[in-house]
């Protein structure tokens, strides 16, 4: 994937930003060792990731959650990697889930997605939990990236 | 990523070697069904990959482990993708956290780690656990790998 | 990975379904977002991935179930991705077990597998499961899929 | 168990010369790349030099180059730090550690202080 200037590496790889927004969406930063090619994908909004070229991407997602189950609903925690194309609505491209810990005062746990998805241009891809304050923002814990094939 | 000699293809993914040495690092082999695809990644005294190109990278770790809650200490096991660069400290790149289980002798659990990053030539990458003896070195339960976008 | 008509993106990305045969070999279908690059790959019955080409890939399989302490054997659930090449015995390649939860009626959880493998013209990959009747076929849950570096 | 002993440090001039080892036991020393890092008084840690297993590759912080040798004998497990022209800065507790998994193993460290 040594690529030419026709064609050049496009990856990216960001990095978990806790948030006081009350948005099930998660926050992420060009911080610490992240990955940005160049602006053929953009991190927008801090929220998604939007690429400017048409093709098959592996899109990939980790969370790191702390939970217990007598403190949170009976439904487990859920993570969705989502994809919203222009003039489309949003759907889900990946969902992981995970009952909660009965360990105190939360469990941790780590969930993993990753898959190859075809984007068009202009597509933006971003994350969904349940509840993003149970989510772990420690060195390495949580993060979100891509690569075009 | 078919490539020419100029630009060759750079991968590789090897298996958990159990260990009687007393470090946090995990220990690996060349061994089963392996890959290791040329000399422009080695490794390192069985528990480093070390590239010799600069590059933007997948990595990746899996980790299966067995632990019980009462037999092991309050904190969660973690597994630590890290990174050491020539002349630099070592740093986490990624890590996954899962509490113990409350399973009896111990409970299973495997972890996924990866994630895109940027090497430079004699980068060196290794896995860390916080328990190098609960982990499973049954076939295909433990591994690591990158390849070379 | 943008290649030409001598060396074509090779990719696929296929979804769960819930199958009523008594097999431990997971089915998979062509539906929801998913994705065939060509016929360089193809899903063969429901539920192994064919490659015609020799080379390096990545595969991946992520698996969703929900299982219960007390309903289920003692025996963890496992999910295995195999490889079965021509002339060869099936092996497993990757492998991860997740101890069955005490949350009732049943407790979900998420595994992901993937790692770099040499692949033989007409080699097939596919995903054992201990107990299928335990995956989860929601949107996004249980998928597999490889790309060829 | 493994063990990691550092010595040599002392009391030297500015301009002086200080010759640091670290005996190493309970693991493969020939196996390990190895690395000197240092703390000043009331400092952070700092990366100052590492070597590879063979020995045949060094590196060196830029505030060390030129005046610091590392090197290493795996017949006597020992890893070696030659301290040439020092200066007040260099005043540290010197560590020696493996490059891979620097934080499983450390020993007490020697004092260095550089003062007229």
């Known amino acids: 994937m040594q690529k030419g200037d026709q064609n050049p590496q496009i990856a990216a790889h960001v990095i978990s930003e806790a948030s006081s927004k009350t948005t099930s969406v998660l926050q992420w930063a060009e911080k610490g060792y992240y990955t940005m090619s160049n602006n053929l994908v953009t991190l927008e909004n801090g929220k998604q990731l939007t690429v400017k070229r048409q093709g098959l991407y592996y899109i990939y997602a980790q969370v790191t959650f702390c939970s217990n189950r007598e403190a949170s609903s009976q439904a487990p925690f859920i993570a969705s990697l989502c994809l919203k194309s222009p003039g489309r609505f949003e759907r889900i491209l990946l969902r992981a889930a995970n009952t909660h810990s009965s360990a105190k005062p939360c469990g941790q746990q780590s969930i993993h997605l990753g898959g190859v998805f075809e984007l068009q241009p202009g597509a933006s891809v971003f994350v969904n939990v349940t509840d993003p304050s149970q989510v772990s923002h420690g060195t390495g814990f949580t993060s979100f990236g891509l690569l075009k094939l | 990523m078919q490539k020419g000699d100029q630009n060759p293809q750079i991968a590789a993914h090897v298996i958990s070697e159990a260990s009687s040495k007393t470090t946090s690092v995990l220990q690996w082999a060349e061994k089963g069904y392996y890959t290791m695809s040329n000399n422009l990644v080695t490794l390192e005294n069985g528990k480093q990959l070390t590239v010799k190109r600069q590059g933007l990278y997948y990595i990746y770790a899996q980790v299966t482990f067995c632990s019980n809650r009462e037999a092991s200490s309050q904190a969660p096991f973690i597994a630590s993708l890290c990174l050491k660069s020539p002349g630099r400290f070592e740093r986490i790149l990624l890590r996954a956290a899962n509490t113990h289980s409350s399973a009896k002798p111990c409970g299973q659990q495997s972890i996924h780690l990866g994630g895109v990053f940027e090497l430079q030539p004699g980068a060196s990458v290794f896995v860390n656990v916080t328990d190098p003896s609960q982990v499973s070195h049954g076939t295909g339960f433990t591994s690591f790998g990158l390849l070379k976008l | 990975m943008q290649k030409g008509d001598q060396n074509p993106q090779i990719a696929a990305h296929v979804i769960s379904e819930a199958s009523s045969k008594t097999t431990s070999v997971l089915q998979w279908a062509e539906k929801g977002y998913y994705t065939m690059s060509n016929n360089l790959v193809t899903l063969e019955n429901g539920k192994q991935l064919t490659v015609k080409r020799q080379g390096l890939y990545y595969i991946y399989a992520q698996v969703t179930f929900c299982s219960n302490r007390e309903a289920s054997s003692q025996a963890p659930f496992i999910a295995s991705l195999c490889l079965k090449s021509p002339g060869r015995f099936e092996r497993i390649l990757l492998r991860a077990a997740n101890t069955h939860s005490s949350a009732k009626p049943c407790g979900q959880q998420s595994i992901h597998l993937g790692g770099v493998f040499e692949l033989q013209p007409g080699a097939s990959v596919f995903v054992n499961v201990t107990d299928p009747s335990q995956v989860s076929h929601g949107t996004g849950f249980t998928s597999f899929g490889l790309l060829k570096l | 168990e493994v063990q990691l002993l550092e010595s040599g440090g002392d009391l030297v001039q500015p301009g002086g010369s200080l010759r640091l080892s670290c005996a190493a036991s309970?693991?493969?020393?020939?196996?390990?790349?190895m690395m000197w890092v240092r703390q000043a008084p009331g400092k952070g840690l700092e990366w100052v030099s590492e070597?590879?297993?063979?020995?045949?590759?060094?590196y060196y912080a830029d505030s060390v180059k030129g005046r610091f040798t590392i090197s290493r004998d795996n017949s006597k497990n020992t890893l070696y730090l030659q301290m040439n022209s020092l200066r007040a800065e260099d005043t540290a507790v010197y560590y020696c550690?493996?490059?891979?998994?620097?934080?499983?193993?450390w020993g007490q460290g020697t004092l260095v202080t550089v003062s007229s």
């Open positions: 309970g693991f493969t020393f020939s196996d390990e790349g």
């Open positions: 550690a493996k490059t891979i998994g620097m934080f499983d193993y």
């Open positions: 070597i590879n297993q063979q020995g045949s590759a060094t």
